[in-house]
């Protein structure tokens, strides 16, 4: 008998996204500076590179929780009935949404812990000391950059709230907790709060990006930074969710 | 059928305390400097203001878990019997203590994460660089302030331990976990450890306050800082708990 | 009826290890500098000393989860049968492995939170400012120490991954979660992932140690630093696990 049958697909998908993002980030953050200016940034691999991978995997998996629902709604609208069977792959996907969500939460928590560990690292300490030295040498009294401060205060705050909501979803997935809820309560948490956390995660990524969309330095070897790729699928899901939420389509779906 | 009936009261109370604390902190931290000296501190809202709200809500909700027990004991002492029905509002409150506790834990965890995120913020980095520059300008070899160091080491440590105990209470609230405990075990954890976490949270707040009680700068527009308001209810609960724990009263309650 | 009978042994062991490590660390970190050079480092007690105790307790308890399995296998190999009853103490120990594991996770989480709190402490801030001042005074442009950066990036990353795996073990210990798993799935997580987390924890400690093994300054009053003592038992367990995993012995055990 197979081990963890419902986890196969989510883990496979997560592993593929993680591997591709890792290689992509490695190329941009480590190999590019090595090739172009002989700068050795291998020390970035254990934390900084990994922590570009984690949010990418997390937000993609979370989008993949809500994408099949969107596809199912479109299929139903196209078929005009809910009695026609879904394709096998969609059926399988629909049944593993809980696992996708839990994996997403797992990666989000890891992302949070890695992020919180940034200022305790020696690399950060040494950089700080060098910045302080440079500030004194330049006789620059005030290091403050207002827009940069705003950017970080907002995206950190949104990230924490998004993670908190994701945690509620994870807790209500514990069998005995979900058993203590009515179906309506469980559905309310999983659908409403889930979309809210996807929305917060997406805004978190967009505010992290801030003005980097138009910063030519971000396009290393003509490749877009990871956050641009990361937000693509969540934005697609959110747009479709919003469209399906429009009164006209909503009525149609409820009729079906 | 209503969604989450047992959560209505705790969420309502939490929302009211959060809103009031938010507005109060906004007044003191943002509006006051803007009105009196045109200082724009809006950047404080997403993290610093929110993180004054979270512990206030958390410790108040935790106090509200143990306050009805105190009131019930006083009512029983007054009535001289345990067979007389409690007033409806007290009954309702008694039945939602678990929810109050879980919400308290939720806000405490958020408070911890927000606090841990402080040093990773750009605002903190820029301040550090400015402080370093100023220290060089002042030709000051040693920045160390002993009492300030002690204050923070103690309150951070107590905060973490308090949160850990609160986490144990939360875990034992998971239905299947509480089902695996005897009633005596469950009651021991919820009552004894609960009061310990309330005590630790209160001491955490008091040591955070340290010498700010007598610092005139803390009283913005004659308003006391949030920690003074925050510790009021927990201290009241702890005092009454201690009084009810006195042998003479304890015997009386056990007789009833 | 006794409270928490299965928790007595693990809590007793944890308390003993914690107390001894606390006293040992106090001697090395606080009493030694006081006695030899009148330096008052009492401020280290609430966080820095405690955070030497926590990982020591955590990794030891985790090793104690897998040590009885090793002893049991050796006993079986010695007896040549699995039908001979284990000694009472080993039996009792085998039955409390779950509690040892959960306690280990509890201490590991505490260790993580204490570690993450380091850079938010005033003591760290003041030290940073002093280092910056000294760097300017020495006119040292670059504070970077490559090997030190590498050491910390690796051990932090491994520590987080180890904690994440330990979290999976803890979650699957929730009754309703373990009930939803087949015996093979549960066993797979608890044995395979458990050993992986012990291995990661040990490597985390060894990389934390780095080149301190041969640093004479580490041997205060001829005593070895805590990490040397901490990794002893986990290494013993891992070596025995590896030996028992050798094809020849593995076949023998499976036959029994």
């Amino acid at each position: 008998q197979e081990l963890f049958p419902q986890w196969h697909l989510p883990i496979k998908i997560a592993a593929i996204i993680a591997s591709l993002t890792f290689l992509y980030t490695l190329l941009r953050e480590v190999i590019h500076p090595l090739a172009t200016s002989h700068q050795q940034y291998f020390y970035k691999i254990p934390i900084l590179v990994i922590n570009k991978v984690l949010p990418m995997v997390s937000i993609t998996l979370l989008a993949l929780v809500y994408l099949p629902g969107v596809i199912a709604a479109i299929v139903q609208l196209h078929n005009g009935t809910k009695y026609k069977k879904f394709p096998h792959w969609l059926d399988k996907w629909m049944l593993t949404r809980k696992q996708f969500g839990l994996l997403s939460f797992f990666f989000a928590v890891l992302h949070a812990i890695y992020s919180l560990s940034y200022p305790m690292r020696r690399s950060y300490r040494y950089k700080l000391l060098n910045w302080a030295y440079q500030q004194v040498q330049q006789n620059k009294e005030d290091a403050w950059i207002e827009h940069d401060v705003w950017r970080m205060e907002i995206y950190v705050s949104l990230g924490i709230v998004g993670l908190a909501i994701l945690a509620l979803l994870a807790v209500t997935s514990i069998p005995s907790v979900s058993d203590s809820l009515t179906w309506r309560e469980f559905h309310y948490i999983q659908s409403k709060l889930g979309i809210v956390s996807l929305l917060l995660g997406t805004i978190h990524a967009l505010i992290f990006a801030w003005n980097k969309w138009i910063d030519i330095k971000q396009f290393v070897w003509y490749t877009p930074p990871t956050f641009m790729i990361a937000v693509f699928l969540p934005i697609v899901v959110l747009i479709f969710k919003s469209i399906l939420f429009l009164p006209c389509l909503r009525k149609k779906i409820l009729k079906i | 059928q209503e969604l989450f009936p047992q959560w209505h009261l705790p969420i309502k109370i939490a929302a009211i305390i959060a809103s009031l604390t938010f507005l109060y902190t906004l007044l003191r931290e943002v509006i006051h400097p803007l009105a009196t000296s045109h200082q724009q501190y809006f950047y404080k809202i997403p993290i610093l203001v929110i993180n004054k709200v979270l512990p206030m809500v958390s410790i108040t909700l935790l106090a509200l878990v143990y306050l009805p027990g105190v009131i019930a004991a006083i009512v029983q002492l007054h009535n001289g019997t345990k067979y007389k029905k409690f007033p409806h509002w007290l009954d309702k409150w008694m039945l939602t203590r678990k929810q109050f506790g879980l919400l308290s834990f939720f806000f405490a965890v958020l408070h911890a994460i927000y606090s841990l995120s402080y040093p990773m913020r750009r605002s903190y980095r820029y301040k550090l660089l400015n402080w370093a520059y100023q220290q060089v300008q002042q030709n000051k070899e040693d920045a160390w302030i002993e009492h300030d160091v002690w204050r923070m080491e103690i309150y951070v440590s107590l905060g973490i331990v308090g949160l850990a105990i609160l986490a144990l209470l939360a875990v034992t609230s998971i239905p299947s976990v509480s089902d695996s405990l005897t009633w005596r075990e469950f009651h021991y954890i919820q009552s004894k450890l609960g009061i310990v976490s309330l005590l630790l949270g209160t001491i955490h707040a008091l040591i955070f306050a340290w010498n700010k009680w007598i610092d005139i700068k803390q009283f913005v527009w004659y308003t006391p800082p949030t920690f003074m308001i925050a510790v009021f209810l927990p201290i009241v609960v702890l005092i009454f708990k201690s009084i009810l724990f006195l042998p003479c009263l304890r015997k009386k309650i056990l007789k009833i | 009826q006794e409270l928490f009978p299965q928790w007595h042994l693990p809590i007793k062991i944890a308390a003993i290890i914690a107390s001894l490590t606390f006293l040992y660390t106090l001697l090395r970190e606080v009493i030694h500098p006081l006695a030899t050079s009148h330096q008052q480092y009492f401020y280290k007690i609430p966080i820095l000393v405690i955070n030497k105790v926590l990982p020591m307790v955590s990794i030891t308890l985790l090793a104690l989860v897998y040590l009885p399995g090793v002893i049991a296998a050796i006993v079986q190999l010695h007896n040549g049968t699995k039908y001979k009853k284990f000694p009472h103490w080993l039996d009792k120990w085998m039955l409390t492995r779950k509690q040892f594991g959960l306690l280990s996770f509890f201490f590991a989480v505490l260790h993580a939170i204490y570690s993450l709190s380091y850079p938010m402490r005033r003591s760290y801030r003041y030290k940073l400012l002093n280092w910056a001042y000294q760097q300017v005074q020495q006119n040292k442009e670059d504070a970077w120490i490559e090997h030190d950066v590498w050491r910390m990036e690796i051990y932090v990353s491994l520590g987080i991954v180890g904690l994440a795996i330990l979290a999976l073990l803890a979650v699957t210990s929730i009754p309703s979660v373990s009930d939803s798993l087949t015996w093979r799935e549960f066993h797979y997580i608890q044995s395979k992932l458990g050993i992986v987390s012990l291995l990661l924890g040990t490597i985390h400690a060894l990389i934390f140690a780095w080149n301190k093994w041969i640093d004479i300054k580490q041997f205060v009053w001829y005593t070895p630093p805590t990490f040397m003592i901490a990794v002893f038992l986990p290494i013993v367990v891992l070596i025995f696990k590896s030996i028992l995993f050798l094809p020849c012995l593995r076949k023998k055990i499976l036959k029994i």
Epitope: - | H38, Q39, K140 | -
Partner: antibody, heavy 124, light 113 residues
Amino acid sequence: EVQLVESGGGLVQPGGSLRLSCAASGYSITSDYAWNWVRQAPGKGLEWMGYISNSGSTSYNPSLKSRFTISRDNSKNTLYLQMNSLRAEDTAVYYCARERNYDYDDYYYAMDYWGQGTLVTVSS
Amino acid sequence: DIQMTQSPSSLSASVGDRVTITCKSSQSLLYRSNQKNYLAWYQQKPGKAPKLLIYWASTRESGVPSRFSGSGSGTDFTLTISSLQPEDFATYYCQQYYNYPRTFGQGTKVEIK
């Protein structure tokens, strides 16, 4: 009531030395304040000379070319300004002034209390 | 060093007049991190020590009459006496405490017309 009383001024020959004192009453010089020396040449503006913080660190005006040293005696609650290699252009009224000590929120503070000053005349 | 330039260097006014003194610094005195301008105004009467009137560009020292007000941000600052009183005839100095060395303006002497 905080009071700062300077003393030690007077006539001194060029190249000579002088030590000015500033006795503080009503406040400990080691508490939350830094202490400055400011001078004012006759009919001229104010010139900041240097300061000593509550922790004892000092900072000087670079234009004074290290001829001046600020120190303190905690037991006497007194600040000192040691002046060496005096020149005619050092003729001025010398004030000591108090400012709140540096902190990490507001950084620096203005000088809120001044002594009445002591006149130093450098002349042959 | 930060240069402080006051204008005018002297002015004549009558009791009850509104008097404005300006002070320019060679660089911004605003710390963006705490939104404070590190500029103070002092009043000095002949033979007396200077007295602090305004700090952080606009905050009145306790005991200073409300007719004295400070304004400005960055590099341009103003001290205003809304209604000049006989005791206000003195020399006024601005001072930056944004960094070291502390520097003063050359002073503005307010005389009786």
